[in-house]
Amino acid sequence: MAPTSSSTKKTQLQLEHLLLDLQMILNGINNYKNPKLTRMLTFKFYMPKKATELKHLQCLEEELKPLEEVLNLAQSKNFHLRPRDLISNINVIVLELKGSETTFMCEYADETATIVEFLNRWITFSQSIISTLT
């Protein structure tokens, strides 16, 4: 079935929401004053070999648990990331975007990445798909 303008608009809004969430995480941690950044960078993330279509979000979904674990280090009294809620929200968006009908086996690149590289990769992915929809 061809995508309707309303379904395209919904996809675009969901991607924009995902993009904002990922950017918020990146801005929250990738701050030279973040006392835990050095240690957060010791965690490794798997990167997709290819990420050009919505089905490739399967690769992001599979790394959400490790992402939550690292974000647990980023909380502070005045900075309420609430990792569990944030990751839960991202998970809901990812599931809706990639669809649950098709089963896609994610292929990962050989090299692992830091949390900053990982977030930047998925931010770029979201921006790229949004640009094709607009």
Epitope: P35, R39, T42, K44, N72, L73, K77, F79
Partner: antibody, heavy 121, light 111 residues
Framework: EVQLVQSGAEVKKPGESLKISCKGS????????IEWVRQMPGKGLEWMGV????????NYNEKFKGQVTISADKSISTAYLQWSSLKASDTAMYYC??????????????WGQGTTVTVSS | AIRLTQSPSSFSASTGDRVTITCKAS??????????MNWYQQKPGKAPKLLIY???NLESGVPSRFSGSGSGTDFTLTISSLQSEDFATYYC?????????FGGGTKVEIK
């Protein structure tokens, strides 16, 4: 009981290599970062570097970069600190410690008993 | 690197005394409302032991006579009533910036 047990005292000659160990037990070793701290005779404490046993990712104090190598083998819950060529100035007590950083904390809650390294010709 | 200056470097006290040790950082160790300052106790030939974390939080199992306070660059460790087992060296440590640094230590001796 959560503990870190370090290898025994070492006496070495300048130029020799050395690898000391720190074995964790009583907790999920891969889930906590391990740090190394040096204490020279009669002196204070100096942070050397950190390893994530789960990923193998490391970070070093600039002062110790290229001087030591930190590694880990998560299958045997052990972290290592090694030198390829010891100097007399490496004579010190070396401690491993477990880093806790959840929430708004960042501290060492469990320490190894220390390994004394003596380098003398 | 952040320099931590402890004072005094050593002093003599008697059991029952109220003891105050100060730690001054060369720059603020605060980040988003939290003070990344910890205190450790070390006895001769032993590993350091955590007493206080994030400036004022008492580590589990540490007696309540130990307390910590301060923010920014000025911090204090207080022992309300010194006990015989408290004679040791105390170190402050900042975990706000790499490299983590420790103060030079304060040795508490028996008078």
């Amino acid at each position: 009981e959560v503990q870190l047990v370090q290898s025994g005292a070492e006496v070495k000659k300048p130029g020799e290599s050395l690898k000391i160990s720190c074995k964790g037990s009583g907790y999920a070793f891969s889930n906590y970062l391990i740090e190394w701290v040096r204490q020279m005779p009669g002196k204070g404490l100096e942070w050397m570097g950190v390893i994530n046993p789960g990923s193998g990712g490391t970070n070093y104090n600039e002062k110790f970069k290229g001087q030591v190598t930190i590694s880990a083998d998560k299958s045997i819950s052990t972290a290592y600190l090694q030198w390829s060529s010891l100097k007399a100035s490496d004579t010190a007590m070396y401690y491993c410690a477990r880093w806790r950083g959840e929430g708004y904390y960042a501290y060492y809650d469990v320490w190894g008993q220390g390994t004394t390294v003596t380098v003398s010709s | 690197a952040i320099r931590l200056t402890q004072s005094p470097s050593s002093f003599s006290a008697s059991t029952g005394d109220r003891v105050t040790i100060t730690c001054k950082a060369s720059q603020s160790v605060d980040y988003q409302g939290d003070s990344y300052m910890n205190w450790y106790q070390q006895k001769p030939g032993k590993a350091p032991k955590l007493l206080i974390y994030t400036a004022s939080n008492l580590e589990s199992g540490v007696p309540s006579r130990f307390s910590g306070s301060g923010s920014g660059t000025d911090f204090t460790l207080t022992i309300s009533s010194l006990q015989s087992e408290d004679f040791a060296t105390y170190y402050c440590q900042q975990s706000n910036e790499d490299p983590y640094t420790f103060g030079g230590g304060t040795k508490v001796e028996i008078k």
